[in-house]
């Protein structure tokens, strides 16, 4: 039985849609993560960011190797014991988004509203179309504000 | 509008294999991921794998690794699952769908009419 | 795999009065606030058809009766008032994790 101090520490487990599962688990040394019990497996060493365990780990201390994520498809962005990277996002042209920085193996893809689409909230996981102005323009549609359109009889100054 | 055509069935005898198709149209086929479903007779839906028609990347459900393989044709915006070394376990209706994708949660916004796969000798 | 259990396994519900139907994950299938958990309705000799996606949110086209609700291991479809049309087979799916996973379905019908 485990006798000296316990602590609960975070341990990211990836899984294969690119989403993160934080599990809290039991571990005896508070600045390693060897022989961290994990899932009922028994994994020694992390992968670093970029790759995944070439398998799953096993009770008898067989340690895979760990093997890189598929570039531009997945990829961890933190060290972990999964043997599955996380899935990259896709920006969904039907959300109204469009790529700004391409997926890596250490980092999920960013997206943005595509031109003439906005989106007013922190998270945007889906962009609206600009308003198209009938009787001109205030103020000019931005990636985060839709267009303010001057009302009918209104006059220009 | 979407749409993605299915032919509407298939006959083919045990041991052989079936490549089924699905045109896509209404949309850039290239733009979106192309998912396949299983469906028994009477029964539920079982996912096969995906493909993206951009660069013909292949992700598959563990189960059917050996038993479907995917491939596109963007010059004809065509998707294909040919279906190996047939058993009367593989007879089922298939469908391919369209993905989408809403902050890395993944779902199927368009259905093919699905082929029904009728294995016998 | 994720196992979705789908329950009652099939009901019958009154025109106008609330039909509710229940997912249950074997696991979680949220990340960071966000629920993976997908709805469809089938129709006999039918393609299934998309209804909720994220939990919560309507597939453009499908009326605001139909709702999703839940998070974790709970998700529950409701359908207020249901109408003629409704009468078919519901599945869940997540997507929060390989392979994705359908339930078993639930045949709604109308009395």
């Known amino acids: 039985r485990l006798s000296s101090k316990s602590v609960n520490a975070q341990v990211t487990d990836i899984n294969s849609k690119g989403l993160e599962l934080r599990k809290t688990v039991t571990t005896v040394e508070t600045q390693n993560l060897e022989g961290l019990h994990h899932d009922g497996q028994f994994c020694h060493k992390p992968c670093p960011p970029g790759e995944r365990k070439a398998r799953d780990c096993t009770v008898n201390g067989d340690e895979p190797d760990c093997v890189p994520c598929q570039e531009g498809k997945e990829y961890t962005d933190k060290a972990h014991f999964s043997s599955k990277c996380r899935r990259c996002r896709l920006c969904d042209e039907g959300h109204g988004l469009e790529v700004e920085i391409n997926c890596t193996r250490t980092q999920n893809t960013k997206c943005r509203c595509k031109p003439n689409f906005f989106c007013n909230s922190t998270v945007c996981e889906h962009c609206d179309p600009c308003t198209k102005c009938e009787h001109g323009i205030i103020k000019e549609c931005t990636l985060t504000s839709n267009t303010k359109c001057k009302e009918e009889g209104s006059r220009s100054n | 509008q979407v749409q993605l055509q299915q032919p509407g069935a298939e006959l083919v005898k045990p041991g052989a294999s079936v490549k089924l198709s699905c045109k896509a149209s209404?949309?850039?086929?290239?733009?979106?991921?192309m998912q396949w479903v299983k469906q028994r007779p009477g029964q539920g839906l079982e996912w096969i794998g995906e493909?993206?028609?951009?660069?013909?990347?292949?992700n598959y459900n563990q189960k059917f690794k050996g038993k479907a393989t995917l491939t596109v044709d963007t010059s004809s915006s065509t998707a294909y699952m040919q279906l190996s070394s047939l058993t009367s376990e593989d007879s089922a209706v298939y469908y391919c769908?369209?993905?989408?994708?809403?902050?890395?949660?993944?779902?199927?916004?368009?259905w093919g009419t699905g082929t029904t796969v009728t294995v016998s000798s | 795999d994720i196992v979705l259990t789908q329950s009652p396994a099939s009901l019958a519900v009154s025109l106008g009065q609330r039909a509710t139907i229940s997912c249950k994950a074997s696991?979680?299938?949220?990340?960071?606030?966000?629920?993976?958990m997908n709805w469809y309705q089938q129709k006999p000799g039918q393609p299934p058809k998309l209804l909720i996606y994220?939990?919560?949110n309507l597939e453009s086209g499908i009326p605001a009766r139909f709702s999703g609700s839940g998070s974790g291991t709970d998700f529950t479809l409701n359908i207020h008032p249901v109408e003629e049309e409704d009468a078919a087979t519901y599945y869940c799916?997540?997507?929060?994790?390989?392979?994705?996973?359908f339930g078993g379905g639930t045949k709604l019908e109308i009395k």
């Open positions: 209404g949309y850039t086929f290239t733009s979106y991921w």
């Open positions: 769908a369209r993905n989408r994708d809403y902050s890395n949660n993944w779902y199927f916004d368009v």
């Open positions: 799916q997540q997507s929060n994790e390989d392979p994705r996973t």
């Open positions: 994220a939990a919560s």
């Open positions: 493909i993206d028609p951009s660069d013909s990347y292949t």
């Open positions: 696991q979680s299938v949220d990340y960071d606030g966000d629920s993976y």
